[in-house]
């Protein structure tokens, strides 16, 4: 029999006494074959978190500062449900830490020195800690001890708790620095006030601070928020213009054997019987021996992390470098204005080679940084282990959720001025063998399919999204007989058709020798029915393009395309006759690095671009014979987006509600988990 | 199709010296960049050193200032050059070419440095 015993660990008598009153009133609700509560008390949360990764406890709730801790080796504990605060309509997990300063004052956030700053309290989290922790390396040094490094950073500040004897800079504007509320400058309000009084030119607080403080519209648009790209917004803008999105309160568990299903099915039947409003005789959610005993009082209840988040993703790169840099204290040697080499996300072994070239030829410009499937990247990107890579539009729509922006965008076609003119997109296309004269859009069912990947533009989520709105479910993986698209679950009989060997069968990467357009296509070609590609394909493949075995004798003749109107027509009619327009693949990066992938780029495509003519005894950016390592190799040049530079505005208002309605049939464990930090 | 011998490991002690060789043969005509590669046990393999047909060269922040690459087209005939030799620069060494824009599966044998004392 499993054990289905939680032990869950507390820090004082008084926790250890509300969580023995826990385990014994889930004992009267649940089931004898449920799970069940076990107490543990330590010392501390270190204590604590150290007892977690030691097996001899399995469970504790924790702020953001020590999720941080929780997650470093030797401890590797993972978030696993979250508190949540408001309404159940519209739980809050999240808080924003925000600079807020007067309309009219003019500065931005890379000119805060010299400034005066206001801050709820030293060694708080949105007051002190993000923001002193992401200005870190702009302090003067020494910037040991911190307090003066910040003390000689802004001109003046009011910073409660800090030693106004040996700091008194940090205390000039509130005199004193009283570490109580009888210090009218001390906390989230305090801090505000210290702004709106003038006392202050920059407050650190959390979004909500200034609609607590002014109920008045016109009153909140005299004040904005400090973006760290700088440039400002509006205070309601908090979601795109913030320090760091900090989780309020958090069950941690082991990464590996954590039981965070069991602690989840414990969370979620503790909520139902002593959540909000449930039970008189216990409330999961009060203290009546003290103040946030094992969870925060003023929680509403529990919401279950999406298992792919890890605490690097669930505290996001903002908060984690802005931790990192006080607890480390290290700042890179390089002068800030100088651009460090873009670390590029290369998939799988060929990508890699690949990358590794170009690195070379680019004298360390680019670095290179594997992963092993595109979503496995883009987390990487996330939190800071690489910076860029050129997606498919089905990607860029989820590295957009996951905050990531558009900075350089494929084009396909020949121009004078390629590099300024973004395009409009290529088509997705049905391809067919011309011998199955009897196929047509209208009788796909039972027949077998090619796909480039789950989750891409023409192999997926056009054709799909489609097929969607004709089937109204999601399992395509009965509507086809079998079928490559190369992602699926393993078991899928979307993987039946593919060629990749062992545990490379089906990978959404060019180990999975049907992986891609060209891959697609190949399915096509030897066991296929139909193949969903991009209009380019055939052409590209056929007529000796592609030295290949299976490719060198094809004819493009030998080849029709499906009409969405029951038609048939040669390849050459890919323009009148296609399923959708897809927007061209794009370079997609975090904000923080947008300037400088976009100037390293465009350096690197006009020394190994389309202007290089022989690519056998040069490196050539956009070749890969057929395999589209790393661009698509019929890549002209990279072209500037101008105002197209978000997920939503690239892709398109049409093509973002197709993948939106599609997210029903999502199996994109990264999605599920990048709504969750932005629903 | 490119074919590359590597040639010159061996056992050193911490602080030695050691010079790899890759000699290519085949249609070297197309070699543009060439790049030795090393793969400790139960390690990625990772790129140590590359050098462009130009004497372009790029090396891993590990091994810089310690590690030289060279070529000498003349004999197609790439050098790793390893002085200051570390316990953690043991490992198998590769060469290789980035001629086949197919970005091959194929290595060498490799050659095996064992940095010990």
């Known amino acids: 029999v499993p054990d289905k015993t939680v032990r869950w660990c507390a820090v004082s008598e008084h926790e250890a006494t509300k969580c023995q009153s826990f385990r014994d009133h889930m004992k009267s609700v649940i089931p004898s074959d449920g799970p069940s509560v076990a107490c543990v008390k330590k010392a501390s949360y270190l204590d604590c978190i150290r007892a977690i990764a030691a097996n001899e406890a399995d469970a504790v709730t924790l702020d953001a500062g020590l999720v941080y801790d929780a997650y470093l080796a030797p401890n590797n504990l993972k978030p696993v449900v979250a508190e949540f605060y408001g309404s159940k309509e519209d739980p809050q997990t999240f808080y924003y830490a925000v600079a807020v300063v007067k309309k009219d004052s003019g500065f931005q956030m890379n000119q805060l020195r010299g400034k005066k700053s206001c801050h709820t309290g030293l060694g708080r989290s949105a007051g002190w800690n993000i923001p002193i922790g992401l200005l870190y390396c702009d302090l003067p040094e020494p910037r040991k001890p911190l307090e003066k490094a910040v003390a000689n950073f802004f001109s003046g500040s009011c910073a409660p708790c800090a030693d106004g004897t040996d700091f008194p800079q940090l205390c000039q504007l509130c005199p004193g620095c009283g570490c109580s509320t009888l210090n009218q400058y001390f906390g989230y309000s305090g801090a505000f006030k210290c702004l709106k009084d003038g006392a202050g030119d920059v407050a650190f607080v959390k979004h909500s601070t200034i609609f607590e403080n002014l109920a008045n519209k016109a009153d909140r648009d005299q004040y904005e928020l400090l973006c760290l790209d700088n440039t400002r917004k509006p205070v309601d803008e908090y979601k795109d213009c913030h320090l760091a999105q900090v989780p309020s309160h958090t069950v941690v568990a082991r990464s590996m054997g954590g039981k965070e299903d069991l602690i989840w099915e414990l969370l979620n039947q503790a909520q139902e019987h002593f959540g909000k409003d449930k039970s008189k005789e216990f409330q999961l959610f009060s203290s009546p021996h003290g103040k946030d005993l094992l969870f925060k009082d003023s929680a509403h209840g529990f919401l279950k992390v999406p298992p792919r988040m890890d605490a690097k993703m669930y505290l996001g790169y903002e908060y984690v470098t802005a931790i990192r840099n006080l607890r480390e204290g290290t700042c890179p040697e390089a002068p800030t204005d100088e651009c460090k080499p873009v670390k590029w996300c290369a998939l799988s072994h060929h990508e890699r080679l690949k990358c590794d070239e170009w690195s070379v030829n680019s004298v360390g410009k680019i670095e290179c940084v594997s992963a092993e499937t595109t979503e496995d990247c883009i987390a990487k990107i996330m939190n800071g282990e690489a910076d860029a890579m050129s997606l498919d539009g089905g990607f860029v729509y989820i590295a957009g959720k996951c905050g990531l922006v558009p900075v350089l965008a494929e084009n396909y076609n020949k121009s004078d001025n390629c590099e300024d003119t973004p395009e409009a997109g290529y088509f997705a296309i049905a391809v067919v063998k011309k011998s199955a004269s009897d196929l047509t859009w209208d009788n796909l069912k039972g027949k077998k399919s090619c796909h480039t990947a789950v989750g891409r533009t023409a192999g997926w989520n056009i054709p799909m999204g489609l097929l969607y709105n004709k089937i109204n479910h999601c399992r395509f993986d009965e509507f086809f007989s079998e079928g490559c698209a190369p992602g699926s679950k393993k078991d899928s009989s979307l993987c039946k058709l593919c060629m990749g060997s062992g545990l490379n069968l089906c990978e959404p990467n060019n180990k999975e020798g049907y992986y891609g357009y060209t891959g697609a296509f190949r399915c096509l070609v030897e066991k296929g029915d139909v193949a969903f590609v991009k209009h380019q394909t055939v052409p590209q493949n056929t007529g000796g393009k592609n030295p290949d075995p299976w490719a060198k004798n094809l004819n493009e003749k030998d080849y029709e395309l499906l009409c969405l109107d029951g038609t048939r027509k040669p390849v050459e009619e890919y323009a009148n006759c296609h399923l959708a327009r897809a927007p061209n693949h794009a370079v997609v990066t975090r904000k923080d690095k947008e300037a400088c992938v976009h100037k390293i780029l465009r350096q690197q495509q006009h020394l190994f671009g389309s202007n290089v003519t022989d690519c056998s005894g040069n490196f050539c950016l956009f070749r890969s014979e057929t395999k589209d390592l790393l661009f698509r190799d019929d890549t002209v040049c990279l072209a500037k987006l101008h105002d197209r530079n978000t997920y939503e505005k690239y892709l398109g208002e049409e093509y973002v509600k197709a993948v939106g309605n599609l997210r029903k049939c999502s199996t994109s464990s990264l999605l599920e988990a990048c709504t969750f930090r932005r629903p | 199709q490119v074919q590359l011998v590597e040639s010159g490991g061996g056992l050193v002690q911490p602080g030695g010296s050691l010079r790899l060789s890759c000699a290519a043969s085949?249609?070297?005509?197309?070699?543009?960049?060439m790049g030795w590669y090393r793969q400790a046990p139960g390690k990625q393999r990772e790129l140590v050193a590359g050098?462009?047909?130009?004497?372009?060269?790029n090396y891993a922040n590990s091994v810089k200032g310690r590690f030289t690459i060279s070529r000498d087209n003349a004999k197609n005939t790439v050098y790793l050059q390893m002085n200051s030799l570390k316990p953690e620069d043991t490992a198998v060494y590769y060469c290789?070419?980035?001629?086949?824009?197919?970005?091959?599966?194929?290595w060498g044998q490799g050659t095996q440095v064992t940095v010990s004392s």
């Open positions: 085949g249609s070297i005509f197309s070699i543009n960049t």
């Open positions: 290789t070419d980035y001629s086949s824009r197919y970005y091959h599966d194929y």
């Open positions: 050098i462009t047909r130009g004497g372009t060269t």
